[in-house]
């Protein structure tokens, strides 16, 4: 079965800056990735970026740079300043829409014991399944 992993890292150089990395472990082709914070997309979460593998990338503050890292993983850098900046216990979620598997979402946050600049290895987070 497909899985989604989420990794959250606080940058050592800027303590209010976060990097979120997400990946899809499955055989299908990815049609869309949505990154949100504050909970799953459509369940109280706020969209930070939407990435289409060919059409392009859309992102909104405090997202600074969303990009594809590979054909099945993405990264997102968050700028931390002002009221909309993330905090250490913020939950980030990534939803991968894939054909033919459907839609798969996982969430993660900064590991409680992490030092800045360190992060837990990118292990699959709890999986939520939703039909396309």
């Amino acid at each position: 079965t497909p899985e989604v992993w989420v990794q959250v890292r606080m940058e050592a150089t800027e303590l209010s800056s976060f990097t979120i990395r997400c990946g899809f472990l499955g055989s299908g082709s990815i049609s869309l990735v949505t990154v949100s914070w504050g909970g799953p997309n459509g369940a109280g979460g706020t969209t930070l970026a939407v990435l289409h593998p060919e059409r392009g990338i859309r992102q909104w503050a405090p997202a600074r740079q969303a990009r594809w890292e590979t054909q099945s993983s993405i990264s997102l850098i968050l700028e931390g300043s002002g009221a909309s900046s993330p905090c250490a216990n913020t939950t980030f979620c990534c939803k991968f829409a894939s054909f033919p598997e459907g839609s798969w979402e996982a969430c993660g946050s900064l590991p409680p014991s992490s030092d800045p600049g360190l992060s837990a290895p990118p292990t699959p987070a709890p999986i939520l399944r939703a039909d396309l």
């Epitope: 059409r55 909104w60 594809w68």
Partner: antibody, heavy 114, light 113 residues
């Protein structure tokens, strides 16, 4: 079927404001940004900015900051663009678009004339 | 901002012949992570909104005839109409879909010779 239907043509005086609407149907309105594009008479296409209706997050082209303001109403699946302090050079057709410019409204002609 | 420059500004081609429009970007539109080029092509006829023809530099939008094709990578891209039809008379625009703000080329007017 995805459709974007815009409000009708407007004639405005210099210094006034205008609000253009864009009603979407056929897709999940809150999940994809509504883009706004300007085309002056006989000219090319210019991106004004975008709004993500689900969160009202916006991105503006620097050139249009202070000129354009975007809002969206998810209860009616309608996005709005207000243009303020109108000048004759704001005379143009204004388009809304969605899903990475795959779908377009029919355009709204805004004419600014004294 | 990324500057998109099209050539030629206008083009006259005989019916059934090949039409080629070029587009050059001031920065690379290639996303190295997934090796995709974020470049789109549009067709606009008088009094109508633009119509998306090609995205990802070479992927045809649904419903677009296969006589339209896109190619190129990095900073240099081409839209080709393999056999010009009367209904293809229009202005064609390329667009940077790689980074904000999305920017368009100045347009190429295609006419029948």
């Amino acid at each position: 079927e995805v459709q974007l239907v815009q409000s009708g043509a407007e004639v405005k005086k210099p210094g006034s404001s205008v609000k253009v609407s864009c009603k979407a149907s056929g897709y999940t309105f809150s999940s994809f940004s509504i883009e706004w594009v300007r085309q002056a008479p006989g000219q090319g296409l210019e991106w004004i900015g975008e709004i993500l209706p689900g969160s009202n997050s916006t991105n503006y082209n620097e050139k249009f900051k202070g000129k354009a303001t975007f809002t969206a109403d998810t209860s009616t699946n309608t996005a709005y663009m207000e243009l303020s302090s109108l000048r004759s050079e704001d005379t143009a057709v204004y388009y809304c678009s969605s899903y990475w410019f795959a779908y377009w409204g029919q355009g709204t002609l805004v004419t600014v004339s004294s | 901002d990324i500057v998109m420059t099209q050539s030629p500004d206008s083009l006259a081609v005989s019916l059934g012949e090949r039409a080629t429009i070029n587009c050059k970007s001031s920065q690379s539109l290639l996303n190295s992570g997934n090796q995709k080029n974020y470049l789109a092509w549009y067709q606009q006829k008088p009094g109508q909104p633009p119509k998306l023809l090609i995205y990802g530099a070479s992927t045809r939008e649904s419903g677009v005839p296969d006589r339209f094709s896109g190619s190129g990578s990095g900073t240099d891209f081409t839209l080709t109409i393999s056999s010009l039809q009367a209904e293809d008379v229009a202005v064609y625009y390329c667009q940077n879909a790689h980074s904000y703000p999305p920017t368009f080329g100045q347009g190429t007017k295609l006419e029948i010779k």
